[in-house]
């Protein structure tokens, strides 16, 4: 049951509706739960999650990562250049859930859902961006050269691969909802 | 096999209370929020009631507001729909439906139940 | 009364391209994604495209969807006979803080 969760029957009291923002709050939330069943089954599939960050670190993957020019913590803060890192950030991680897809057994469908209900919220991001014209999409070209790489890779990379796609995501979703909460 | 299997339609009075069920499997049901669409005999869809994820939350349409309550059992892997004073206009098929899209804007419905009917008449 | 419009029918011979409108209002498709179902005669609706413009997995590249200001689309291009269906728009609608679907399109392959 993920966080959250009761796992009661749950008639639900009359609450008021939930705010855009709020609803940005729990999307993340949500992701995050879903990427949390993920990490399980890769933790528990291979040893991965036993190694250390140094060794994990020496790849060549280009996973989004918040900087201090990215205005996203409080010290420097810029909502607009936050928010624009933000969107640029979860668009660029887009091939990477695209590569998570058929990594999994027992939590495919999860797999499916935190790539589904992320494209969900850049849309929602999208038009909360006064600056849509900074936000650079990726190249599809780029992308599917870069996912027939990565799916090319022998299992014990694409093991690795899976577990820092994941940590990455999870760290960058951590960084966005702390940001998104001070908008 | 992913599957959402509705039960507890039927023909009901005027006035009258019915509980459907809709049971599902092959899926982490308690990661996903869930909705009730009704359709009324030769007319379009009509979203009626959706639980988010995290069960305390729900909304529903302003025609059923007050009268209809949705809930879950993630234990029993169960959506329920409480419907109380029906209404000849809620005479529709019910179909219950997984969203997937997670807390923004309802989801987007990616599984369908085969739909239950209830007809409301005396 | 739907608070998305959509024509009630829509026609196109074998391989032809169809487009269905969508149409709505800052509320609704102005703020939020749309979603495309496709009901075919006697079952119940399918997921035809999110987040405006995305296919779920199964759903053939001949169906696109696409989004401009309060106003969307769904195409089919290279129309099949087992396209005949009916197809539903719908957005979350913040006024209404609900889920409103389309009126429905009858798509008949001639």
């Known amino acids: 049951v993920p966080p959250g969760e009761d796992s009661k029957d749950v008639a639900a009291p009359h609450r008021q509706p939930l705010t855009s923002s709020e609803r940005i709050d729990k999307q993340i939330r949500y992701i995050l739960d879903g990427i949390s069943a993920l990490r399980k089954e890769t933790c528990n599939k291979s040893n991965m999650c036993e190694s250390s960050k140094e060794a994990l670190a020496e790849n060549n993957l280009n996973l989004p990562k918040m900087a201090e020019k990215d205005g996203c913590f409080q010290s420097g803060f810029n909502e607009e250049t936050c928010l624009v890192k933000i969107i640029t950030g979860l668009l660029e991680f887009e091939v990477y859930l695209e590569y998570l897809q058929n990594r999994f057994e027992s939590s495919e469908e999860q797999a499916r859902a935190v790539q589904m209900s992320t494209k969900v919220l850049i849309q929602f991001l999208q038009k909360k961006a006064k600056n849509l014209d900074a936000i650079t999409t990726p190249d599809p070209t780029t992308n599917a050269s870069l996912l027939t790489k990565l799916q090319a890779q022998n299992q014990w990379l694409q093991d690795m691969t899976t577990h820092l796609i994941l940590r990455s995501f999870k760290e960058f979703l951590q960084s966005s909802l702390r940001a998104l909460r001070q908008m | 096999e992913v599957q959402l299997l509705e039960s507890g339609g039927g023909l009901v009075q005027p006035g009258g209370s019915l509980r459907l069920s809709c049971a599902a499997s092959?899926?982490?049901?308690?990661?996903?929020?869930m909705a009730w669409v009704r359709q009324a005999p030769g007319k379009g869809l009509e979203w009626v009631s959706s639980i988010y994820p995290s069960g305390g939350y729900t909304d529903y349409a302003d025609s059923v507001k007050g009268r209809f309550t949705i809930s879950r059992d993630n234990s029993k892997n169960t959506l329920y729909l409480q419907m109380n004073s029906l209404r000849a206009e809620d005479t529709a098929v019910y179909y219950c439906?997984?969203?997937?899209?997670?807390?923004?804007?309802?989801?987007?419905?990616?599984?369908w139940g085969q739909g239950t009917m209830v007809t409301v008449s005396s | 009364q739907s608070e998305l419009t959509q024509p009630p029918s829509a026609s196109g011979t074998p391989g032809q391209r169809v487009t269905i409108s969508c149409s709505g209002s800052s509320s609704n498709i102005g703020s939020n994604t749309v979603n495309w179902y496709q009901q075919l005669p006697g079952t119940a609706p399918k997921l035809l495209i999110y987040?405006?413009?995305q296919r779920p997995s199964g759903v053939p590249d001949r169906f696109s969807g696409s989004k401009s200001g309060t106003s969307a689309s769904l195409a089919i291009s290279g129309l099949q006979s087992e396209d005949e269906a009916d197809y539903y728009c719908a957005a979350w609608d913040d006024s209404l803080n609900g889920y409103v679907f389309g009126i429905g399109t009858k798509v008949t392959v001639l």
């Open positions: 439906a997984r969203s997937a899209g997670g807390w923004i804007g309802g989801g987007a419905f990616d599984i």
């Open positions: 092959g899926f982490t049901f308690s990661f996903y929020g």
């Open positions: 987040s405006n413009n």
